[in-house]
């Protein structure tokens, strides 16, 4: 299985390669075969990645910021390939390789242009600040400076703030919105051009639920097909907001199945779950339990959030008795 | 065809420098490694020096070391050779050498020389 | 540094005669050896690398064998135009040393 790069041609044998942060990459290069084989890798013309020639490495003047992270394919030489094996790419390693490849026929020079992109996973959270309710799109970090965008009932708001902090290697950003009072359906997306990699965040605010104390209340979360693919590894949680934070009260891992439950009156249907229905039913309900509750399911490219406003009223015994 | 032309010899006196040039042609020159070989009227080849393709890398036999400097210049397509505190026994032809590849095997094709000479 | 040291340092033989010339270097040099041909008056001229690959254009009459120390270069049937001086030189790593030489004539 090789690494997660792409190879772009482009003409005057210089290619494209697309790598990501940390991850381990190749960059092609290939002769005619022939005898006395001699394969110089360098960086930027400059500095010394990899030499192989008389049938072996030679790494002494080898830059040492390419120490124990670069190998030939050594089995693959006398066939004609030349490709440099690269260990955890960063930032730093991003630019111009040139591989000079010769044999007692020809030399030959090809040049690899390395980029590399980063992207952690992003998340939308949703947050209550004071009276004012904000979703804010967050990437903790990412290379290139991403594309983020916010729809409004589908629709693209032009309103768009972005708190930006860089690091050496990296961008991380923030990007809030504020929701205050709107009962729309609110979608952020996240895009790495280099990566080819996009994110979406939706947020959907369900009508509001009036509930009698002891009665149980359902709550619905089924992910939109747009963006859910089951066969891909996802994680559902349930949280209740109280006094301006979240308490976790289920969740459930796609990869293990398994179901973590921290409240005694919450119920999943595990039918449901098979059916990637994550609705679930709190019983028994009592006065404190009033407030918005949040489903979130998340991937690596989406989070799908849904809120609830639960209502619990007293029930008329209750009433009475007061 | 590999054509390797030098020139730059000439009579000198002890001590002095004299820098000897190596047109080459026919070739992708920035592609090789190149030698100096000298070789006194009559006797053998002494190997003198050795610069890889992009110029990283040089070599000298003791002989010389610390007094000949070879280098190149590969947008001119020339290989150089300053030699200083020039001694009377560096007197020879000089051959400017072309490397089968990148200035880490044996030379495949010969200038014609220039003759130094070291005399008081 | 590995010293090359050849022999004989000269020798005459009839056209038509089988002629070796040795080469022995001081420390292993794997097959990293190649032979040159120096006529009077003219370059050198590259017969054998990789101890016995025959370079192009090279008469089939001109061998090279052996690995490590000991190296043989070998006329199978000497010719007028094969007067000429003998160099082996080791490539394995710089100094990229050459041999004395061998002078070899006709009788």
């Known amino acids: 299985i090789f690494p997660l790069a792409f190879f772009i041609y482009v003409p005057m044998n210089e290619q494209i390669v697309i790598g990501r942060l940390d991850e381990d990459i190749i960059l092609p290069s290939s002769f005619e075969r022939g005898s006395e084989v001699v394969i110089h890798w360098k960086y930027q013309d400059s500095y010394k990645v990899h030499s192989y020639y008389k049938g072996s490495d030679h790494l002494e003047s080898q830059d040492p910021r390419y120490a124990n992270r670069t190998s030939l394919f050594y089995n693959e030489i006398q066939n004609g390939n030349a490709s440099l094996f690269f260990r955890r790419v960063s930032l730093l390693d991003e630019g111009i390789y040139t591989c000079y490849v010769g044999t007692a026929i020809q030399v030959i020079t090809n040049k690899v242009v390395l980029k590399v992109g980063v992207f952690l996973t992003p998340v939308m959270k949703y947050e209550k600040r004071n009276t004012n309710s904000f979703l804010i799109c967050s990437v903790l970090s990412v290379y290139p400076r991403p594309i983020i965008t916010w729809k409004m009932d589908n629709t693209p708001i032009s309103e768009n703030n972005m708190e930006e902090t860089g690091s050496l290697d990296s961008f991380s950003i923030n990007s809030p919105l504020n929701i205050t009072g709107s009962n729309s359906s609110y979608e952020c997306t996240i895009e790495n051009s280099l990566l080819k990699q996009t994110w979406t965040g939706r947020w959907t605010m369900k009508d509001g639920l009036h509930k009698m104390q002891s009665e149980h209340v359902s709550l619905s979360c089924q992910p939109v097909n747009d963006y859910f693919s089951p066969n891909q590894d996802f994680k559902v949680t349930w949280s209740r907001m109280k006094s301006g934070t979240f308490s976790v009260l289920a969740y459930y891992l796609s990869s293990s199945q398994n179901t973590i439950i921290n409240e005694s009156r919450f119920s999943w249907n595990k039918e449901l779950i098979n059916q990637s229905d994550f609705s679930m039913n709190l019983m028994d309900l009592n006065l404190s339990d009033s407030g918005e509750y949040l489903c979130n399911i998340s991937s690596d490219e989406y989070t799908l959030l849904t809120i609830h406003t639960v209502h619990v009223e007293p029930s008329q015994e209750t009433a009475s008795h007061n | 065809q590999v054509q390797l032309v030098e020139s730059g010899g000439g009579v000198v006196q002890p001590g002095r420098s004299l820098r000897l040039s190596c047109a080459a042609s026919?070739?992708?020159?920035?592609?090789?490694?190149m030698h100096w070989v000298r070789q006194v009227p009559g006797k053998g080849l002494e190997w003198v020096a050795v610069i890889w393709y992009e110029g990283s890398e040089k070599d000298y036999a003791d002989s010389v070391k610390g007094r000949f400097t070879i280098s190149r210049d590969n947008s001119k397509n020339t290989l150089y050779l300053q030699m200083n505190s020039l001694r009377v026994e560096d007197t020879a032809v000089y051959y400017c050498?072309?490397?089968?590849?990148?200035?880490?095997?044996?030379?495949?094709?010969w200038g014609q020389g220039t003759l130094v000479t070291v005399s008081s | 540094d590995i010293q090359m040291t050849q022999s004989p340092s000269s020798l005459s033989a009839s056209v038509g005669d089988r002629v070796t010339i040795t080469c022995r270097a001081s420390q292993g040099i794997s097959n990293y050896l190649a032979w040159y041909q120096q006529k009077p008056g003219k370059v050198p001229k590259l017969l054998i690398y990789?101890?016995?690959t025959l370079q192009s254009g090279v008469p089939s009459r001109f061998s090279g064998s052996g690995s490590g120390t000991d190296f043989t270069l070998t006329i199978s049937s000497l010719q007028p135009e094969d007067v000429a001086t003998y160099y082996c030189q080791k490539y394995q790593s710089a100094p990229f040393t050459f041999g004395p030489g061998t002078k070899v004539d006709i009788k």
């Open positions: 050498a072309k490397d089968l590849i990148s200035g880490i095997y044996y030379v495949d094709h």
């Open positions: 990789a101890a016995s």
């Open positions: 026919g070739f992708t020159f920035s592609n090789y490694g």
